[in-house]
């Protein structure tokens, strides 16, 4: 006999990276017929929603109107059908950005490279941080973590045309409080692929959210819960 229901999906809209003082909605999708959803923050009950009518609703939204560092952290949700509770969702890491300062991002040997060359990004931030994150825009982007007193190195490659794109970096004051994004660096990769290794398999996060962090019009993005979920769960591990 089944003791628990399948775990729900959890994700953030428009994005799990939220500029301070901006709004964000945490979504939890369970099953039709669920009479109660609970949102947990850092292991404690944070909010409850009871959809009406439950048989017509399989998703609830928890609205945060004003993002700040106190609201940043790990969220999970569960739902109940009758007396039976679900497994908890995966953890959603909700990150507050645009805190304090702006890092600078540079790329060596330069922004225009030839396929097969090795590339290193350097992210620098003079304020008190020791963790840095390099993110590439786009649906199948890459996230790298680096450490250093005021700057971190992010080796890439040998590059292929798959590495083309726009990169930004953040300084991280803690796992869930990030700096402003750096100015973008656009990496251009030209030439044939000559015995190069494939791009590294890093966690992905969905499409273009820079500047205003608004959701793009890409179809199906809001339904791509597993991708959001996977990113939020793995980005900071």
């Amino acid at each position: 006999q089944q003791q628990t229901l399948p775990k729900p999906f959890i994700w953030a809209e428009p994005h799990f990276m939220v500029p301070k003082e901006k709004q964000v909605t945490i979504c939890c999708q369970g099953n039709y017929g669920a009479v109660e959803y609970q949102l947990h923050f850092e292991g404690s009950l944070f909010a409850v929603d009871r959809p009406k009518p439950p048989e017509r609703i399989n998703k609830v939204q928890f609205y945060i109107p004003d993002m700040n560092s106190r609201m940043a952290g790990q969220y999970s949700c569960i739902y109940r059908v009758g007396e039976l509770w679900s497994e908890p969702s995966n953890l959603l890491d909700l990150v507050v950005t645009e805190m304090y300062d702006t890092p600078t991002l540079s790329v060596h040997p330069g922004p225009e490279v030839i396929s097969g060359e090795k590339v290193t990004f350097y992210c620098r931030l003079d304020t008190a941080t020791s963790m840095f994150l390099l993110l590439k825009e786009g649906r199948s982007s890459h996230v790298q973590r680096g450490y250093g007193k005021v700057q971190a190195e992010f080796p890439l490659g040998p590059v292929t045309t798959a590495h083309r794109g726009t990169y930004r970096c953040f300084g991280s004051y803690n796992n869930h409080a990030w700096s402003f994004p750096s100015e973008p660096v656009k990496l251009l990769v030209t030439g044939d692929i000559e015995n190069t290794s494939l791009a590294p398999e890093d966690p992905t996060f969905p499409a273009d959210t820079w500047g205003t962090y608004l959701l793009t019009t890409e179809t199906g993005l809001q339904k791509d819960h597993a991708l959001w979920d996977h990113t939020a769960q793995n980005l900071l591990r």
Epitope: S106, H108, P109, S115, G116, E117, T120, R124, G191, T196
Partner: antibody, heavy 115, light 107 residues
Framework: QVQLQQPGSELVRPGASVKLSCKAS????????MHWVKQRPGQGLEWIGT????????NYDEKFKNKATLTVDTSSSTAYMQLSSLTSEDSAVYYC????????WGQGTLVTVSA | EIQMTQSPSSLSASLGERVSLTCRAS??????LNWLQQEPDGTIKRLIY???SLDSGVPKRFSGSRSGSDYSLTISSLESEDFVDYYC?????????FGGGTKLEIK
């Protein structure tokens, strides 16, 4: 065209410091890495470190971290390398070289450490 | 630190001869390799970047290639001004490192 101007020579006392200059022209100074390279008489080339003038990002070879300090003055498009606590081992020609791929080289400054 | 082992350290050859210099990388450097030429007065000039791309103004007799971790500079027909020093340089990973150099001498 790209030019990197370095003084021909510097004579310094042991234990003193020296600040070498490299004046850049013919390109956007803040958009390219500037590397520094050492060559002792009759020896090969050794990379010291690099600086990105647009952001002051620096990167040093571990063995030069306590010896060399790289800085830039973007208003005059000049890169500097300060060498401290000089000994006879620091007597060498020092080159500045532009771009992540070491595309253009200065003529080098001969530093002689002598009492 | 990536070691660049350059060979030979010196080479005697005749005008018009074809010669090859080699650098072996101790770790993967992709195509991030330069060949540099140094004149007796100390002037340094880049000949080849990214393993095989020829710098503008460099004669076509110079070419670069790669086979696995071995990188080669070939001069197809030696001219008198080619009898100088040559260095390879990897810029894949810091600290960036040079080969020990090759002194090309006229036979």
């Amino acid at each position: 065209q790209v030019q990197l101007q370095q003084p021909g020579s510097e004579l310094v006392r042991p234990g003193a410091s020296v600040k070498l200059s490299c004046k850049a022209s013919g390109y956007t100074f803040t958009s390219y890495w500037m590397h520094w390279v050492k060559q002792r008489p009759g020896q090969g080339l050794e990379w010291i470190g690099t600086i990105y003038p647009g952001s002051d990002i620096t990167n040093y070879d571990e063995k030069f971290k306590n010896k060399a300090t790289l800085t830039v003055d973007t208003s005059s498009s000049t890169a500097y390398m300060q060498l401290s606590s000089l000994t006879s081992e620091d007597s060498a020609v020092y080159y500045c070289t532009r771009d992540g791929r070491f595309a253009n080289w200065g003529q080098g400054t001969l530093v002689t450490v002598s009492a | 630190e990536i070691q660049m082992t350059q060979s030979p350290s010196s080479l005697s050859a005749s005008l018009g001869e074809r010669v090859s210099l080699t650098c072996r990388a101790s770790q993967d450097i992709g195509s991030s390799l330069n060949w540099l030429q140094q004149e007796p007065d100390g002037t340094i000039k880049r000949l080849i970047y990214a393993t095989s791309s020829l710098d503008s103004g460099v004669p076509k007799r110079f070419s670069g290639s790669r086979s696995g971790s071995d990188y080669s500079l070939t001069i197809s027909s030696l001219e008198s001004e080619d009898f100088v020093d040559y260095y390879c340089l990897q810029y894949a990973s810091s600290p960036y490192t040079f080969g020990g150099g090759t002194k090309l001498e006229i036979k």
